[in-house]
């Protein structure tokens, strides 16, 4: 069988949801010594980067200016060391946002609930869309989808304190073109049905995978690079529609 290098890791810097006309940045983390990185969009070559010097950096950034619906979709990357190519990375879904209109997000029975209460979010958008998306701040990969003519329901079932946080919704014109985000709605969940005093919300952190982890080689890094790269590939969870 034809020999290939381990697949690279593709990430979006800061977020995979990019407002229209803004710049998207995708990182392809490959290997020290890679002389060429290729970014593929919907299966076709989109861009090429050649790191300088190749032996000192383990990846590259691809800048995609002026984001629009034609540039939104599935990206992957590969890299080359000498004449040897890597396997293709997992697919990354890049979404353009701030298209057309702004939905309204609401929550029943209210923004303050007790653990065990049934909560339902509603996302409403009067323009032509049938797919709606609900995202929790700091958990933007955990997208919930629902369908409806002008409004979609997101039943959360009986909630726990793990549901605390700030939520936004989008209307989706296709898988990769989303509306402006709704105003956020913060959900406060107190510990139990008897205790209705307010508890603080859990802190939210940026998505840890929405960060480019490109490093310049120093000392031991080269020896650890292949092991580390293989481990990351093994544990990396990619985003699927």
């Amino acid at each position: 069988p034809k020999q290939t290098l381990p697949k690279p890791i593709i990430r979006a810097e800061s977020t995979y949801m990019v407002p229209k006309e803004k710049q998207a940045t995708l990182c392809c983390q490959g290997s020290y010594g890679a002389v060429e990185y290729q970014l593929h969009f919907e299966g076709s070559l989109f861009a090429v980067e050649r790191p300088k010097p190749p032996e000192r950096i383990n990846g590259v950034k691809f800048h995609i200016p002026d984001m629009n619906s034609r540039k939104a979709g599935r990206y992957s990357c590969i890299y080359r060391v000498g004449e040897l190519w890597s396997e293709r990375s997992d697919l990354l879904d890049l979404v353009v946002t701030e298209m057309y209109d702004t939905p309204t997000l609401s929550v029943h029975p209210g923004p303050e609930v007790t653990s065990g209460e049934k909560v339902t979010f509603y996302c409403r958008l009067d323009t032509a869309t049938s797919m709606f998306l609900l995202l929790k701040e700091g958990r933007s990969r955990d997208v919930q989808r629902s369908y409806g003519k002008v409004q979609a329901e997101f039943p959360m079932g009986p909630v726990t304190t793990a549901h605390r946080g700030s939520y936004r919704c989008f209307g989706s014109y296709n898988n990769y073109a989303w509306s402006f985000p709704s105003e956020p709605v913060k959900l406060l969940v107190t510990g139990d049905i008897e205790n209705t005093s307010l508890a603080p919300t859990d802190p939210t952190f940026p998505d840890s995978w929405d960060t480019c982890l490109l490093t310049r080689e120093t000392g031991l890094q080269k020896d650890l690079a292949l092991w580390d790269h293989t481990a990351q590939n093994h544990h990396h969870h990619h985003h699927h529609h």
Epitope: S106, V107, P109, E117, Y122, V185, K186
Partner: nanobody
Framework: DVQLVESGGGLVQAGGSLRLSCAAS??????IHWFRQAPGKEREFVAR????????FYAASVKGRFTISRDNAKNMVYLQMNSLKPEDTAVYYC????????????????WGQGTQVTVSS
């Protein structure tokens, strides 16, 4: 035809009590909320009850003084208000399946017409 009709408002001395009623007809609801609106102020959540489960929730400003309950047989929801204060003066509304939309705004397809509660000092 869906209707929510409040009653029981009136003038009461500080420290006194009132019981408001909300008659719900026309369909079944998941929740009934009570709200109030004082002159020049935004509509404010007071209390809610789940129709089947009877689970209740109260705004911090009324907790321990107000009690929401319901009578399934009569399709009625009640708000028992004790230890009333002048700051409880407002028009009180009941609403069915109300939803919060952020920035202290609430929406519902079904609102009552309201009943005036005045607490004198």
């Amino acid at each position: 035809d869906v209707q929510l009709v409040e009653s029981g408002g009136g003038l009461v001395q500080a420290g006194g009590s009132l019981r408001l009623s909300c008659a719900a007809s026309g369909r079944t609801f998941n929740t009934i909320h009570w709200f109030r609106q004082a002159p020049g102020k935004e509509r404010e959540f007071v209390a809610r009850i789940w129709w089947i489960e009877r689970t209740t929730f109260y705004a911090a400003s009324v907790k321990g003084r107000f009690t929401i309950s319901r009578d399934n047989a009569k399709n009625m929801v009640y708000l028992q208000m004790n230890s009333l204060k002048p700051e409880d003066t407002a028009v009180y509304y009941c609403a069915a399946d109300a939803r919060y939309t952020g920035s202290r705004r609430w929406e519902s397809d079904y609102w009552g017409q309201g009943t005036q509660v005045t607490v004198s000092s």
